[in-house]
């Protein structure tokens, strides 16, 4: 009954692990979508908004076929860490205007943090090589105006939405290969 002492514990089914990661990612995608709607409603901003410090989108969903799980998880984790930093910056740097997006923005930050921990766990369960700790990123520049901060918020939430959408599709596709 049970494995002999000293033998490795059977690791959980990686497909189940991936499933729970997809669920968390989907949930965060929905949070981001709702917050983006709220932002557009309260602070309309025409056109696309960019922020140089944001990661570029990993790639189109169509190009996912060629990807391998390790590279997807590694890239996703790096991008989401950047978005976490940007959300933290947004919450602290912005004055009264964006304070009206609380507590939703705080909840988004907490869930993004949770997803990152889940990705870290998944990578260790799949025995993927652990990345060295990221070098400290340069501090994000203060917004030059409230309007600049609002545009940054649009860019951050819009970019996070695209990244999470890409992540859900990619993880689901890669699950079929496990």
């Amino acid at each position: 009954p049970g494995p002999p002492p000293g033998s490795p514990r059977a690791s959980p089914d990686p497909r189940a692990e991936l499933d729970s990661t997809v669920l968390l990612t989907r949930s965060l995608l929905e949070d981001t979508r709702q917050l983006t709607i709220q932002l557009k409603d309260k602070f309309p901003a025409d056109g696309d908004h960019n922020l140089d410090s944001l990661p570029t989108l990993a790639m189109s969903a169509g190009a996912l076929g060629a990807l391998q799980l390790p590279s997807v998880l590694t890239r996703l984790r790096a991008d989401l860490l950047s978005y976490l930093r940007h959300v933290q910056w947004l919450r602290r740097a912005m004055g009264s205007s964006l304070k009206t997006l609380e507590p939703e923005l705080g909840t988004l930050q907490t869930r993004l943090d949770r997803l990152l921990r889940r990705l870290q766990l998944l990578m260790s369960r799949l025995a993927l090589p652990q990345l060295p700790p990221d070098p400290p990123a340069p501090p994000l520049a203060p917004p030059s105006s409230t309007w600049g901060g609002i545009r940054a918020a649009h860019a951050i939430l819009g970019g996070l939405h695209l990244t999470l959408d890409w992540a859900v599709r990619g993880l689901l596709l890669l699950k079929t290969r496990l």
Epitope: K42, F43, R91, R92, A93, M94, G95, S96, S97, K99, T100, E102, P139, P142, P143, S144, S145, T146, W147, G148, G149, I150
Partner: antibody, heavy 117, light 111 residues
Framework: QVQLVESGGGVVQPGRSLRLSCAAS????????MHWVRQAPGKGLEWVAV????????FYADSVKGRFTISRDNSKNTLYLQMNSLRAEDTAVYYC??????????WGQGTLVTVSS | QSVLTQPPSASGTPGQRVTISCSGS????????VNWYQQLPGTAPKLLIY???LRPSGVPDRFSGSKSGTSASLAISGLRSEDEADYYC???????????FGGGTKLTVLG
């Protein structure tokens, strides 16, 4: 260069009203949240109210809630503070201040409001 | 009673280094950026430090800010007579939905 000039201060009796104005120039007024901060004679700074760049969001200090109203006219580059039911403890120099986010980068020179019978 | 706590006074001689502390809570300093303002006698306040530790252009590098947890501090090195002023710390407070200030610290340059 950025300039903020307050006006409208003066001596007023308790219970009466007063409207302060802050004329802004040298920057795109409609891109910035704006605040009012006051300082009673010989005392420290006290935050009063803030209005968002578009005028849609407003927050007030508990001490003035229900009595003071902050507003702005972006077409006139002007910030206002309507002060009703004034009390002796509202006596102070009132400053308007610009914020690009979490700090006040420019302040006006202030206008003195004295509430006295 | 101010939400942020500062010592009412501080002093030093020219050339010395002085530090002014500012203590708050998790809803203000702990979760938002700290700013410092200098108010020379008879004038409007002026931004000295923002974003915890950044200096606006024109502010000498003798002035520096730092933050740890729910406390912040302003350090002034190479003290000069023109530094004699009131210094205020400030931050947004999430619980109060507004800006809070410290009570102010009157800095005296001796001699």
């Amino acid at each position: 260069q950025v300039q903020l000039v307050e006006s409208g201060g003066g001596v007023v009796q308790p219970g009466r009203s007063l409207r302060l104005s802050c004329a802004a120039s040298g920057f795109t007024f409609s891109h910035y949240d704006m605040h009012w901060v006051r300082q009673a004679p010989g005392k420290g700074l006290e935050w009063v109210a803030v209005i968002s760049y578009s005028g849609s969001v407003k927050f007030y200090a508990d001490s003035v809630k229900g009595r003071f109203t902050i507003s702005r006219d972006n077409s006139k580059n002007t910030l206002y503070l309507q002060m009703n039911s004034l009390r002796a403890e509202d006596t102070a120099v009132y400053y308007c201040a610009r914020t690009p986010g979490s700090h006040f980068d420019y302040w006006g020179q202030g206008t003195l409001v004295t509430v006295s019978s | 009673q101010s939400v942020l706590t500062q010592p009412p006074s501080a002093s030093g001689t020219p050339g010395q280094r002085v530090t002014i502390s500012c203590s708050g809570s998790s809803s203000n300093i702990g979760s938002n950026y700290v700013n410092w303002y200098q108010q020379l006698p008879g004038t409007a306040p002026k931004l000295l430090i923002y974003y915890d530790d950044l200096r606006p252009s024109g502010v000498p590098d003798r002035f520096s800010g730092s933050k740890s947890g729910t406390s912040a501090s302003l350090a002034i090195s190479g003290l000069r007579s023109e530094d004699e002023a009131d210094y205020y710390c400030s931050a947004w407070d999430d619980s109060l939905s507004g800006v809070v200030f410290g009570g102010g610290t009157k800095l005296t340059v001796l001699g």
